[in-house]
Interface confidence: medium
Amino acid sequence: AILGRSETQECLFFNANWERDRTNQTGVEPCYGDKDKRRHCFATWKNISGSIEIVKQGCWLDDINCYDRTDCIEKKDSPEVYFCCCEGNMCNEKFSYFPEMEVTQPTSNPVTPKPP
């Protein structure tokens, strides 16, 4: 491993649409991939009238937008669906919203869905 890089071997997995997609609903996802590729965790969620609804969480493969991010933070201003990615085992357990354009308004979700 490259010094200072946080290797991602597993991520929190969640799929709100699990019945339609025919997947697990929650669990811990082992992250596989080509040896020369970096691996990340991600989280996607919606903010419905102030209520946080998780859409998906899991592994995300080699995306430069995720490099060296130890925390899962969405910085886009008011997206329809929030997305963040990070490096490090289970780094997507918690995720936050810190828009770069406006006054900082953190929206975090420290709740960890229990594995099945």
Partner: antibody
Framework: EVQLLESGGGLVQPGGSLRLSCAAS????????MHWVRQAPGKGLEWVAS????????SYADSVKGRFTISRDNSKNTLYLQMNSLRAEDTAVYYC?????????????WGQGTLVTVSS | DIQMTQSPSSLSASVGDRVTITCRAS??????LNWYQQKPGKAPKLVIY???SRASGVPSRFSGSGSGTDFTLTISSLQPEDFATYYC?????????FGGGTKVEIK
């Protein structure tokens, strides 16, 4: 090197059955979800079915639901597609493809395809 | 189901040209957007995944951009081996759906 090799295609009459196989090598087959995607002659790509890493979950396109069954044998590193009640519109090249993660971020490796022709 | 609309359906270009193909999803798919290249008689090959990430072995002249509903595949300087059909595909939810394809032909 990742390799996926489909077989089992051929000519079949409407209403008939066929079983496609996809032999996988070069990776730990039991770690990955797998898909079947088809392409009718001169047409675009159409997703057919998927199965998760251990066979516990399967999903189908509406067009094949109830007629096709996807399965896998991890001890043989092989993916299957059982096709029953075949129709002329099922005529296509069938590809097996590997899913990159549990939630199918992308299909990173594909086989060369096997042609299924449904005709009387 | 999420509908994927690609444009143009075909285009003619010369070696060295900059080529842009667009793909629109019927709802937000965040960055769950992939691009595949297919040559006649061959299997599709992954080119771009997660909207912007190049697959292994894909030349740097290929790039992807976009998020939400609008996405673009750009070939900065078209090479002879790039003449093919390109498909976008969403993997945000099942069923996985593909765009209709864009055939890149020699002018």
């Amino acid at each position: 090197e990742v390799q996926l090799l489909e077989s089992g295609g051929g000519l079949v009459q409407p209403g008939g059955s066929l079983r496609l196989s996809c032999a996988a090598s070069g990776f730990t087959f039991s770690d990955y979800g797998m898909h079947w995607v088809r392409q009718a002659p001169g047409k675009g790509l159409e997703w057919v079915a998927s199965i998760n890493y251990n066979g516990g979950y399967t999903s189908y396109a509406d067009s094949v639901k109830g007629r096709f069954t996807i399965s896998r044998d991890n001890s043989k590193n092989t993916l299957y597609l059982q096709m029953n009640s075949l129709r002329a519109e099922d005529t296509a090249v069938y590809y097996c493809a590997r899913a990159a993660t549990w939630h199918d971020t992308h299909l990173d490796y594909w086989g060369q395809g096997t042609l299924v022709t449904v005709s009387s | 189901d999420i509908q994927m609309t690609q444009s143009p359906s075909s285009l003619s270009a010369s070696v060295g040209d900059r080529v842009t193909i667009t793909c629109r999803a019927s709802q937000s798919i965040i960055t769950y957007l992939n691009w595949y290249q297919q040559k006649p008689g061959k299997a599709p090959k992954l080119v771009i995944y997660a909207a912007t990430s190049r697959a292994s072995g894909v030349p740097s002249r290929f790039s992807g951009s976009g998020s939400g509903t609008d996405f673009t595949l750009t070939i900065s300087s078209l090479q002879p081996e790039d003449f093919a059909t390109y498909y976008c595909q969403q993997s945000y939810e099942s069923p996985l759906t593909f765009g209709g394809g864009t055939k890149v032909e020699i002018k």
